[in-house]
Amino acid sequence: NAKGNYCKRTPLYIDFKEIGWDSWIIAPPGYEAYECRGVCNYPLAEHLTPTKHAIIQALVHLKNSQKASKACCVPTKLEPISILYLDKGVVTYKFKYEGMAVSECGCR
Amino acid sequence: NAKGNYCKRTPLYIDFKEIGWDSWIIAPPGYEAYECRGVCNYPLAEHLTPTKHAIIQALVHLKNSQKASKACCVPTKLEPISILYLDKGVVTYKFKYEGMAVSECGCR
């Protein structure tokens, strides 16, 4: 149904080996990044923290889908993860490697 | 071509009458809101200020489009416009009505 397909956070496990980042990220081998999936139909729900522009764009799309594209379901808040990585050949620990995992999705 | 279809800001004129907002926005009759259109294919261009998560998601999508959706082209910076509007029956002028017009797009 439309509600089930609405913008929300869904699981997305990233295996660093699969994307070739295991060459510089030593640990962890992967992590739960999540992704934002689903539609942003008008009216946009409050928990999706839409901007005024997103509300207007969704409304225009509703009235004329040729004139404007839908607002898009994207990460609005990202969290860091901790990693062990190679920096100029030195194994380095970074407690907060920012912007890696989705904590909130919204319509933009 | 792919480059021509890449994430960028495109014109989108909003007529307040068309979306029913003329009931409370007295002036202007409309404005250039712009919208963000186009694809976010890996590698994501620097001017699209991709987050690490967006880069990873685009890379996963490139390798397996079933596993992750593409990163999305969305407004990353919004500008205000000036409006005359009705606030509890009082005609009010607001120099900076925030979040109305796209000034920059990016991949998220």
Epitope: - | P28, Y31, E32, I81, V90, T92, F95, A101
Partner: antibody, heavy 115, light 111 residues
Framework: QVQLQESGPDLVQPSQTLDITCTVS????????VHWVRQPPGKGLEWMGT???????DYNSAFKDRLAISRDTSKNEVFLKMDSLQTDDTAVYFC?????????WGQGILVTVSS | QFALIQSDSMSTSAGSTVKLSCKRS????????VYWYQQHEGRSPTTMIY?????PDGVPDRFSGSIDSSSNSAFLTINDVQIEDEAVYFC??????????FGGGTKLTVL
């Protein structure tokens, strides 16, 4: 610093068209709004129209369909075009910047409509 | 469509207080903010009061704005009137039709 400068003809023949340019400096037309206001000799101020920062335009309905306002943001210019001028259109024409309030005015240009 | 009605002229003496009025013909004076402009002979106007009672930087605190709903009028009060206050004063408000409406102006003479 902020400046607005009107330029155009001093004299226009009746039934002809008036073209005035307001050249601005020290601010962006996508941030600030620009009013056109006129003042007949010895009389009051009359709002003609506004070029809004978002690109929308409003007109005083008293000028019906004979007024057109436009802009070129790359050149920092706002244009006023008014058709079918009559002698009672003789006035000083001002452009003015509207931010939180009208904080800067041009010096005005006196346009006389006469044959 | 309403009009803003101002008396054509007023005289006052230096050092006194003067109150210029701006009456709204129809509708409530409080239903939109009133702005006041000063215009010296041969010069461009300058804003003295905006949003009803706010003064732009550089405007002396001798100038103040107010409204009175019983007379459906806005007022510009000038305390300790100076010679340089001699000018024409215009009020302005908003409407949903003609978006920016000016009063006819009051010529203030300082004796």
């Amino acid at each position: 610093q902020v400046q607005l400068q009107e330029s155009g003809p001093d004299l226009v023949q009746p039934s002809q068209t008036l073209d005035i340019t307001c050249t601005v400096s020290g601010f962006s037309l996508t941030t600030y709004n620009v009013h056109w206001v006129r003042q007949p000799p010895g009389k009051g101020l009359e709002w003609m129209g506004t070029m809004w920062n978002g690109g929308g335009i409003d007109y005083n309905s008293a000028f019906k369909d004979r007024l057109a306002i436009s802009r070129d943001t790359s050149k920092n210019e706002v244009f006023l075009k008014m058709d079918s001028l009559q002698t009672d259109d003789t006035a000083v024409y001002f452009c003015a910047r509207l931010g939180y309030y009208v904080d800067y005015w041009g010096q005005g240009i006196l346009v006389t409509v006469s044959s | 469509q309403f009009a803003l009605i101002q008396s054509d002229s007023m005289s006052t003496s230096a050092g006194s207080t003067v109150k210029l009025s701006c009456k709204r013909s129809t509708g409530n004076i409080g239903s939109s903010y009133v702005y006041w402009y000063q215009q010296h002979e041969g010069r461009s106007p300058t804003t003295m009061i905006y949003d009803g009672d706010k003064r732009p930087d550089g405007v002396p605190d001798r100038f103040s704005g107010s409204i009175d709903s019983s007379s459906n009028s806005a007022f510009l009060t000038i305390n300790d009137v100076q010679i340089e206050d001699e000018a024409v004063y215009f009020c302005q408000s908003f409407s949903s039709g003609i978006k920016f409406i000016f009063g006819g102006g009051t010529k203030l003479t300082v004796l």
